[in-house]
């Protein structure tokens, strides 16, 4: 951290690498929850229009598609992986890419997904043959 | 040697308007995404807007976004930021940064070069 910068006690807006330079937060689709027509599909896009800084470098972008006897929904924020989102922890936030796998929620089907590249959410991947790892 | 100066920054009362520049030398500044970043007294950092080094593309955090305009100048090399409808809680020190280009622009790239920072104090 450059010495014109202070750091504050307890500060989890600061976070450094080993040479102690400042990581920059994600950019993340940040829509909250929409309707949204992604249905029956290998992969969508999030229709969402804004993009923006996560408040804390160490969030990821998230992505929950929720479908039941009403309508469909889909969700994107920032998230720290640390802490569970709808009750599930973010078990793929290393990845690149927003694979989406299903969680059990009882009157609904459920799917989740987090990624830790810029705008990541704005793709979501349902089908199973990114499942695998896949370098791009 | 890379360096980044701030400037415009000032005393002013809430709803107010300021224009924060930041003159960028030492390095190609059309290879960079620019950020603005602030530090309230006894705070830690906040990361308000970035702004891609080609096309212009903007973004900002969600606490000033519609109320601050992140832009530059590629010839003039230099980064602007347009503060409207200032509150008191925009109180800080803002300091501009470069940010190393990382694959895709990934989590593993970091900020290496600021500013000394401008200080913005918003108060009646």
């Known amino acids: 951290i450059p010495p014109h910068v202070q750091k504050s006690v307890n500060n989890d807006m600061i976070v450094t690498d080993n040479n102690g330079a400042v990581k920059f937060p994600q950019l993340c689709k940040f829509c909250d929850v929409r309707f949204s027509t992604c249905d029956n599909q290998k992969s969508c896009m999030s229709n969402c229009s804004i993009t923006s800084i996560c408040e804390k470098p160490q969030e990821v972008c998230v992505a929950v598609w929720r479908k039941n006897d009403e309508n469909i929904t889909l969700e994107t924020v920032c998230h720290d992986p640390k802490l569970p989102y709808h009750d599930f922890i973010l078990e793929d936030a290393a990845s690149p890419k927003c694979i989406m796998k299903e969680k059990k929620k009882p009157g609904e089907t459920f799917f989740m997904c987090s990624c830790s590249s810029d705008e990541c959410n704005d793709n979501i991947i349902f089908s199973e043959e990114y499942n695998t790892s896949n370098p791009d | 040697e890379v360096q980044l100066l701030e400037s415009g920054g000032g005393l002013v009362q809430p709803g107010g308007s300021l224009r924060l520049s930041c003159a960028a030398s030492g390095f190609t500044f059309t290879e960079y995404r620019m950020w603005w970043v602030r530090q309230a007294p006894g705070k830690g950092l906040e990361w308000v807007s970035a702004i891609e080094p080609i096309g212009n593309r903007t973004y900002y955090a969600n606490s000033v976004r519609g109320r601050f305009t992140i832009s530059r100048d590629n010839s003039k090399n230099t980064l602007y930021l347009q503060m409207n409808s200032l509150r008191a809680e925009d109180t800080a020190v803002y300091y501009c940064?470069?940010?190393?280009?990382?694959?895709?622009?990934?989590?593993?790239?970091?900020?290496?070069?600021w500013g000394q920072g401008t200080l913005v104090t918003v108060s009646s």
């Open positions: 940064a470069k940010q190393i280009p990382g694959r895709k622009w990934t989590a593993n790239s970091r900020f290496d070069y």
